[in-house]
């Protein structure tokens, strides 16, 4: 509450996060010309990336294009992308929405669609819709340990959210433990009112506000965290604005003496840790 | 402007980025000894990393070692490294400049001159030039869409930079599109008063400002972002403190049961999209 | 100093870091059922990542669990792990301490112990302690370049903490050398009043904050940054709550038509670097 | 000038196993697809199988699981493991690449042809 006697500092932040949790995932995987079930396990290392303390992301989704290699190829005929004739291909065009350029020739993609020929890496991936439900739906079960440190050097006062009265098997729940910093992925989602199952499927950015409101008089001393979420991206985007959350990355590796790629793009929430507020001293 | 008699309160924000384009790489290429014009497709998962929300990287130019495997090596003859007998040679040491751990013998680096000998990466990183003109310098033809959520929790008010009523193919101009949120990598440079070409070289760092003055009050209500740019890295530094923008990765593989790495320094512009302004209210 | 007649603006800043150093590595390493001394070299790209501005990452030990590979296989005998028959085990149950899921059966871990057997990345990750001293404890040497440009845009106002006339071969010290922007991390830990040498082991975070307290007014200007630095992590953490700074990433590779991973746990240091201040201006 | 040469052709008995191997020579830039055809007298030529610069391969109905289709991108060469031969695999076997004399200047190059000839 604001005490207007006070001189007010905004909060300074460091966040340092721990996923825990594993996942199977089943897939068709087709391997010499044979389609079979896969089955694998997702641990950290397989579906989250080191990245800095503020954000931190769980991959839930992905499509994998293998075996790429710098060739020429028939592009993916997307909407509007095919041709019956070379006219129709401009060499050292580069369409925003392909994968590579084009050398001025139509060719076969299929026995029915003939499709500009590019220079790119090949086969180009298709573009397929993401799987459904999501490969890494059961990531609703994982666990974020969230680590706070706050820092008002004005008033030269530091504390965290973790107490040593703390219990570490806890999971946050808003009415029966507030304090906890164990957060299931799924239950963030629903206190932000909305589906992980859905949100898996395309990705999504979900916000973690950490709010300090901190008393620091000595008579009424007071400064704790309270926790809440909010999804960040616009689930109602329209499709030019590339809905959901997802980024592409490759596996780079050399077979027969050709440098080759395996192709990933991962779908997956992308966790924001937003901390603000204010300490206020007499 | 100021209004003071509202209530003013800094802005809470998440960024998502993402970017499209890809560029065409001509450079020479050496392979059994025979050198040869090679040629190959950049796109997105070739150039970019997945990082978080407030800044991104492109990668512009690059140069590459290939083939390192941990032996002993002479170290490369920069400026003052040269040697004529093991006196200059000091066993254990790490010379800062250096790439390895001096045995603390002179050895012929090439058929003119001599430098000690290491234990590192062999053979060792060149000092050499970034290529000129960079290798991706097409990339100021990419685009990069920004998404930013702003939230002011004391007024409890939430918006974005993109609206429903916004066309995803347009491309951000000052005058004729000042809200679009796609941006060509070198209209902001050209905005920001900078030479794509140039800095694509050695590398630099791009600030993206996104000012939201809010004014939250019923009867003049406004909240719309303003796009300003400018380089933060600069140009002028001396040698010393490393100009441009760079960092060195490797590429790890196992040939013959040695374990190899291929390391790329790759220089490119590093966007920080920094975020700012107050929402005010009666 | 409060001048209660400025108009105060929060800094908005940006932050370039570059770490230079390289570590000998002295561990046992096992081949072929031989287990002998091994020795090698890290440098920049193989002890630290590529990361944000405002963060940046220095590996200073790692446990590797190589040639891991998805099949069968009892999970590791930790407190509380251990069965004596299939009752013990529950198929499909998916432990959050364990790195698999169950199968039912409880099989031979080795000549004295059974364990649950798992589906996962396999033979399972060893719960064994961080090597200790930490592999790569002459990190300690290592130094890190810090530069950091503010804006105030209110004020219209940039500057930089590295001026053209600072020399690049300086060394941060708090007497000697307050504005030099390059620090040996030992001194950042001495300085925090933190052993190195100890944190290595299990890694932490090290925050190094820069406070801007500018005088924007033409008749007193000052802006010029003051540098301090604290520990982060909480080194009194329990157990529970995972002390220390790790994370877990993974190397994949091919074998015999079998996908394989090795694992790596690195330990580290993330240095946060927080920026703050005001500029004020009549 | 780019040359295709096929070598490995002859007589056959029915069952039996030969191995085709055709050569790029000459300046290019980069070898893309390549492939065997093969014209039988009286008939069109047909495509036997085919094979990307990264390996993947394509194979006519009638040689599934008998013939191989396999590269050498370091020789830039082209082979055809044929085994289980039948009186109707006789024809002349002709090699066929996609090769960028330049960058982005791709043409289509074939070579003499080979002939195969299985006895019943």
């Known amino acids: 509450s604001d005490k207007l006697y006070q001189r007010k500092e905004p909060v300074i932040s460091s966040v340092h996060t721990k996923v825990k949790g594993i996942a199977e995932v089943t897939e068709n995987v087709t391997e010499g010309g044979v389609t079979k079930l896969g089955h694998s396990i997702f641990d950290t290392a397989d579906y989250t990336f080191p990245l800095q303390g503020n954000s931190f992301f769980v991959m839930t989704n992905y499509v994998k294009s293998e075996g790429q290699v710098q060739t020429l190829c028939p592009e993916y005929p997307r909407r509007g992308a095919q041709c019956s004739s070379d006219r129709r291909c401009k060499k050292g065009w580069m369409d925003p929405q392909s994968k590579g350029i084009q050398t001025g020739r139509c060719v076969p993609y299929d026995k029915t669609r003939k499709t500009c020929e590019v220079s790119a890496w090949c086969p180009t991936e298709e573009e397929k819709e993401a799987p459904r439900p999501a490969l890494l739906r059961s990531a609703e079960n994982f666990t974020v340990l969230i680590k706070n440190n706050i820092h008002f050097p004005g008033h030269n006062y530091t504390t965290r959210n973790i107490l040593p009265t703390m219990n570490g098997s806890c999971t946050f729940h808003k009415t029966w433990d507030p304090q906890c910093s164990i957060f299931r992925l799924g239950d963030i989602f629903q206190e932000a009112g909305e589906n992980f199952t859905e949100v898996a499927v395309q990705g999504g950015i979900m916000g973690i506000e950490i709010y300090w409101d901190c008393n620091l008089d000595s008579w009424s001393h007071h400064c704790r965290p309270r926790y809440s979420f909010r999804r960040l991206d616009d689930k109602n985007m329209d499709e030019s604005f590339v809905p959901g959350y997802n980024f592409r990355y490759a596996k780079y590796y050399k077979e027969n003496n050709v440098e080759k790629r395996t192709l990933i793009k991962a779908f997956g929430i992308r966790f924001d840790i937003l901390v603000f507020g204010t300490g206020g001293k007499f | 402007s100021d209004k003071l008699y509202q209530r003013k309160e800094p802005v809470i924000s998440s960024v998502h980025t993402k970017v499209k384009g890809i560029a065409e790489v001509t450079e020479n290429v050496t392979e059994g000894g025979v050198t040869k014009l090679g040629h190959s497709i950049f796109d997105t998962a070739d150039y970019t990393f997945p990082l978080q929300g407030n800044s991104f990287f492109v990668m512009t130019n690059y140069v590459k070692s290939e083939g390192q495997v941990q032996t002993l090596c002479p170290e490369y003859p920069r400026r003052g490294a040269q040697c004529s007998s093991d006196r200059r040679c000091k066993k254990g040491w790490m010379d800062p400049q250096s790439k390895g751990i001096q045995t603390g013998r002179c050895v012929p680096y090439d058929k003119t001159r001599k430098t000690c000998e290491v234990s590192a990466w062999c053979p060792t990183e060149e000092e050499k030039e970034a290529p000129r003109p960079a290798l991706l310098r097409s990339a100021e033809n990419f685009t990069v869409l920004i998404k930013n959520n702003i939230h002011f929790p004391g007024h409890n008010y939430t918006t974005r930079n993109i609206l429903p009523t916004m066309n995803g193919s347009c491309t951000f101009h000052k005058t004729w599109d000042p809200q679009c949120s796609i941006f060509r990598l070198g209209d902001i440079f050209q905005e920001a008063g900078e030479n794509f070409t140039e800095v694509a070289v050695q590398g630099g760092i791009m600030g993206i400002e996104i000012y939201w003055d809010c004014n939250l009050d019923s009867w003049s209500h406004h909240c719309r972002p303003r796009y300003s740019f400018r380089r933060l890295d600069d140009k002028n530094m001396d040698e010393s403190f490393v100009p441009g923008y760079n960092f060195r990765y490797a590429k790890y593989y196992k040939e013959n049961n040695v374990e190899k790495r291929t390391l790329i320094k790759a220089f490119g512009i590093r966007f920080d999209i920094l975020v700012f302004g107050t929402g005010g209210k009666f | 100093s409060d001048k209660l007649y400025q108009r105060k603006e929060p800094v908005i800043s940006s932050v370039h870091t570059k770490v230079k150093g390289i570590a000998e590595v002295t561990e046992n390493v096992t081949e072929g059922g031989v287990t002998k001394l091994g020795h090698s070299i890290f440098d920049t790209a193989d002890y630290t990542f590529p990361l944000q501005g405002n963060s940046f990452f220095v590996m200073t030990n790692y446990v590797k669990s190589e040639g891991q590979v998805q099949t069968l296989c009892p999970e590791y005998p930790r407190r509380g792990a251990q069965c004596s028959s299939d009752r013990r085990c529950k198929k499909g149950w998916m432990d959050p301490q364990s790195k698999g899921i169950q199968t039912g059966r409880c099989v031979p871990y080795d000549k004295t112990r059974k364990t649950c057997e798992v589906s996962a990345w396999c033979p399972t990750e060893e719960e064994k302690e961080a090597p200790r001293p930490a592999l790569l404890r002459s990190a300690e040497n290592f130094t890190v370049l810090i530069k950091n440009n503010i804006h105030f845009p209110g004020h219209n106002y940039t500057t930089r903490n590295i001026l053209p006339t600072m020399n690049g071969s300086c060394t941060f010290h708090k007497t000697w050398d307050p504005q030099c922007s390059i620090f040996r991390l030992g001194d950042i830990f001495q300085e925090a009043g933190e052993n190195f040498t100890e944190v290595a082991v299990q890694g932490g975070i090290m925050g190094i904050e820069i406070y801007w307290d500018c005088n924007l007014d033409s008749w007193s200007h000052h802006c010029r940054p003051r540098y301090s630095f604290r520990r982060l992590d909480d080194k009194n953490m329990d157990e529970s709550f995972v002390p220390g700074y790790n994370f877990r990433y993974a190397k994949y590779y091919k074998e015999n038509n079998v996908e394989k991973r090795t694992l790596i746990k690195a330990f580290g240091i993330r240095f946060d670097i927080l920026v703050f201040g005001t500029g004020g201006k009549f | 000038e780019v040359q295709l040469v096929e070598s490995g052709g002859g007589l056959v008995q029915a069952g039996g196993s030969l191995r085709l191997l055709c050569a790029a020579s000459g300046s290019f830039f980069r070898v893309n697809n390549m492939a065997w055809y093969r014209q039988a007298p009286g008939k069109q030529r047909e495509l036997v199988a085919d094979?990307?610069?990264?390996?993947?391969?394509n194979y006519a109905d009638s040689v599934n699981g008998r013939f191989t289709i396999s590269r050498d991108n370091v020789r830039n060469t082209v082979y055809l493991q044929m085994n289980g031969l039948k009186p109707e695999d006789t024809a002349v076997y002709s090699c066929?690449?996609?090769?960028?004399?330049?960058?982005?200047?791709?043409?289509?190059?074939w070579g003499q042809g080979t002939q195969v000839t299985v006895s019943s």
């Open positions: 094979i990307t610069r990264g390996d993947r391969t």
């Open positions: 066929y690449a996609r090769i960028e004399l330049g960058i982005l200047e791709p043409r289509d190059y």
